[in-house]
Amino acid sequence: FTITVSKDLYVVEYGGNVTMECKFPVEKQLNLFALIVYWEMEDKKIIQFVNGKEDLKVQHSSYSQRAQLLKDQLFLGKAALQITDVRLQDAGVYCCLIGYGGADYKRITLKVHAPYRNISQRISVDPVTSEHELMCQAEGYPEAEVIWTSSDHRVLSGKTTITNSNREEKLFNVTSTLNINATANEIFYCTFQRSGPEENNTAELVIPERLPVPASERTH
């Protein structure tokens, strides 16, 4: 009796869904009362499927309402664990253990990343010096650096601060500001540059003709 996996690494986006599969041999029709399926992640029990039913009492609270065994897939010889609304804390090594006559287990790694996609921006002006302050803010994982550029591709020097998100402790809140003398309709870009997996997200900031009070805010 041998379990196989078509993928031993899954990479998923924060807030998305993932279905991880372990395949096992089924001849003719599945005998539910002979089947045992366990899914665990480190010391957390996620699925305990015995005698045709799941036991939600043993499920770790962090997976409550988010993890389920796709029962229809069992009849196709697959123990498929579906996790919805994936969190950064879900990243790790998962183990599927299947008993059906014999027994076997396999490990699967789940990696979770969060792109810096929703970039908030703000432009304000110092009424005394007429210097503009440009601000970009976004949340993601892992850490990102922010590159400021002008429309003629010059790299500019901004100041970036990284804090923990209020939404989820592992999520980073990255805020970057650029102080610059600029003229109306000039265009600047803030690019959130993230490694592992590598991804760039850019917002465009256009200096307005005249700034309303308070400073304008919009989301890219």
Epitope: L32, N51, G52, K53, L56, K57, D72, Q73, F75, L76
Partner: antibody, heavy 117, light 112 residues
Framework: QVQLQQSGPELVKPGASVKISCKAS????????MNWVKQRPGQGLEWIGW????????YYNERFMGKATLTVDKSSNTAYMLFSSLTSEDSAVYFC??????????WGQGTTLTVSS | DIVMTQAAFSNPVTLGTSASISCRSS???????????LSWFLQKPGQSPQLLIY???NLASGVPDRFSSSGSGTDFTLRISRVEAEDVGIYYC?????????FGGGTKLEIK
Amino acid sequence: QVQLQQSGPELVKPGASVKISCKASGYTFTDYYMNWVKQRPGQGLEWIGWIFPGSGATYYNERFMGKATLTVDKSSNTAYMLFSSLTSEDSAVYFCLRSDWDVGDFWGQGTTLTVSS
Amino acid sequence: DIVMTQAAFSNPVTLGTSASISCRSSRSLLHTNGITYLSWFLQKPGQSPQLLIYQMSNLASGVPDRFSSSGSGTDFTLRISRVEAEDVGIYYCAQTLGLPRTFGGGTKLEIK
């Protein structure tokens, strides 16, 4: 609201085949199992099997393996049961029944099949 | 397969009084997760069956609370308090623990 609309009565000859349909509405068709149940005149209920439209996975009561074939058409939210090599023993009312993994909650109105020469 | 057994007829009851219908399974329907996988259906004359109770004691949507169910892992009772004329029909128990799903033979509720 959930509705399961079954096809009309069938009169067929012994040895022939028949395909009964069950059109679902009012819910996400691919998220629930579609069961089929047989009821002979004046008799009880006998579970034939189910199909999960999302994946096409099926399970048959051993008594109906080779007799019934369950299929779905996801584009029209319709489940089908093909009954083959018909005999008088197959004369019955056939119901479709929606269920999740544990609970069957909504039934079709039934399709009467009469096998007679 | 799990065999479900029911008496064909209930004791005749008077309208407004209570009735009990019994069902027995050949193996325990109580799972280690604490849930008992027994359902009750009512088939009124000329109609499709309708779900009354699931997981032994949970009332299905729209079912009056005159209906209740209890039992052990293998012996179950459906109780109808204050029987009404519209309650007549055949009551089926069914197990949803194992595959194939199986039904009892049905119990006809008789009114005096």
